[in-house]
């Protein structure tokens, strides 16, 4: 169920601190605006207060979307979805956020990458990703190329390849040329998830051809 309240919350950390400590979908408000957005809040993992900005779990949602769709978000917050680059950009430019990326493979293993500093540039700068301070179990080297790249979609090619990474690998992502990750790639079912050049990739955990079973990207203020 949607959990609405008269209070205005910028992120799930504010929701958590207001006393709402149950996982679920909450209404968040854009910083310095009255515009609202629905987001899934993880109130249990690692102390709670996490705003889920991406989830892949079953292939039910098409992630080969346009620039505008990645800008405003798509999918279902209770399942597979992308929260929206514009909201995340505005949010992460207000204060310091951490980004946690949780990954599952098809063999029952889980891993994570935690970045102590995360923000997205404005749309004018193509929602370039900025990351620092990597820790975690999903590789000592960042699978999101650093320094960060501009976001690219099938209709917005900002990568560093003469090819068009988003069209070739599918999905919108911070492609390099084309780089060691793409968590918005084509969902591949079990036993069809190896040797996939266009799958859900996190190179420094599972290598280049392995397509993951599930991914979650979540953010939280660093001072939570």
């Amino acid at each position: 169920d949607y959990k609405d309240d008269d209070d205005k919350f910028r992120d799930c950390a504010e929701v958590f601190k207001s006393g709402h400590t149950t996982n679920g979908i909450y209404t968040l408000t854009f910083p310095n605006s009255t515009e609202e957005i629905k987001a899934y809040c993880d109130m249990e993992a690692g102390g709670g207060g996490w705003t889920i900005i991406q989830r892949r779990e079953d292939g039910s949602v098409d992630f080969q979307r346009t620039w505008k769709e990645y800008k405003v978000g798509f999918g279902n917050p209770s399942g597979e979805y992308w929260l929206g680059n514009e909201f995340v950009s505005q949010l992460t430019n207000q204060q310091r956020y951490v980004l946690k990326i949780h990954l599952k493979d098809w063999e029952g293993n889980e891993a994570y990458s935690l970045y102590e500093h995360f923000y997205l540039s404005s749309e004018e700068l193509n929602y370039r990703i900025h990351l620092k301070g990597l820790t975690g179990t999903a590789g000592k080297i960042s699978s999101i190329s650093q320094p960060g790249n501009d976001f690219s979609t099938k209709d917005g090619d900002n990568d560093k390849c003469i090819c068009k990474c988003s069209q070739m690998l599918t999905g919108g992502w911070w492609f390099d040329a084309c780089g060691p990750s793409n968590l918005n790639g084509m969902y591949a079912p079990q036993r069809q998830n190896t040797n996939k050049f266009n799958g859900i990739k996190w190179y420094y955990w599972k290598g280049s051809g392995y397509s993951l079973k599930a991914t979650t990207m979540m953010i939280r203020p660093a001072d939570f």
Epitope: N93, R96, H117, Y119, S121, K132, G133, P147
Partner: antibody, heavy 121, light 107 residues
Framework: DVQLQESGPGLVKPSQSLSLTCTVT?????????WNWIRQFPGNKLEWMGY???????SYNPSLKSRISITRDTSKNQFFLQLNSVTPEDTATYYC??????????????WGQGTSVTVSS | SIVMTQTPKLLLVSAGDRVTITCKAS??????VAWYQQKPGQSPKLLIY???NRYTGVPDRFTGSGYGTDFTFAISTVQAEDLAIYFC?????????FGGGTKLEIK
């Protein structure tokens, strides 16, 4: 291409304030990244002094925190260093530089050519 | 603050030699280490970032490696124009700190 240019007096008297300007061309200082001041002492030791981010937030080296201020003039695409109560130990070449991350310290990819400042009476 | 101890202070080499400079951090700097080259009369120039990534336009004879506390910078085949001072810098924690520099002199 991004260019940074420092300017300011080459000689400052002890106990006075040192004021320097960094003029940036080829990139808006409000768009992204952090804009730093670094100094190099005689003998080549480098010290990061602080930055002002594209959003206007500042971060300073704790060793200078009581004496330093970094501000900006967005209309002129300039940022400034003010260092108060200088002593001869503040004699150095002062550089402005852009770092590759906007909300925290990072490596610096564009540097000015530096301006030499001597503190002496 | 993280202290970056850089060795050696001076390297006297011939053109064509391979040289290695090391930096040891007083505590973990993850892979948030950069290397700079400063030629006489010039400002520092970024060569390597995130310990091992070559900055745009930097020749591939310059390489970096390391993680945690131990970092290495190498020039595979020294050329005359590599005469400079080389600095490491950590930016894992604030304030960012630099090594003391290694002066490379050509015989």
């Amino acid at each position: 291409d991004v260019q940074l240019q420092e300017s300011g007096p080459g000689l400052v008297k002890p106990s006075q304030s040192l004021s320097l300007t960094c003029t940036v061309t080829g990139y808006s200082i409000t768009s992204d990244y952090a804009w730093n001041w670094i100094r190099q002492f005689p003998g080549n030791k480098l010290e990061w002094m602080g930055y002002i981010s594209y959003s206007g937030s500042t971060s300073y080296n704790p060793s200078l925190k009581s004496r330093i201020s970094i501000t900006r003039d967005t209309s002129k695409n300039q940022f400034f260093l003010q260092l108060n109560s200088v002593t001869p130990e503040d004699t150095a070449t002062y550089y402005c530089a852009r770092s590759t991350f906007g909300h925290y310290v990072s490596s610096m990819d564009y540097w000015g050519q530096g301006t030499s400042v001597t503190v002496s009476s | 603050s993280i202290v970056m101890t850089q060795t050696p202070k001076l390297l006297l080499v011939s053109a064509g030699d391979r040289v290695t400079i090391t930096c040891k951090a007083s505590q973990s700097a993850s892979n948030d280490v950069a290397w700079y080259q400063q030629k006489p009369g010039q400002s520092p120039k970024l060569l390597i970032y995130y310990a091992s990534n070559r900055y745009t336009g930097v020749p591939d004879r310059f390489t970096g490696s390391g993680y945690g506390t131990d970092f290495t910078f190498a020039i595979s085949t020294v050329q005359a124009e590599d005469l400079a001072i080389y600095f490491c810098q950590q930016d894992y924690s604030s304030p960012p700190t630099f090594g003391g520099g290694t002066k490379l002199e050509i015989k």
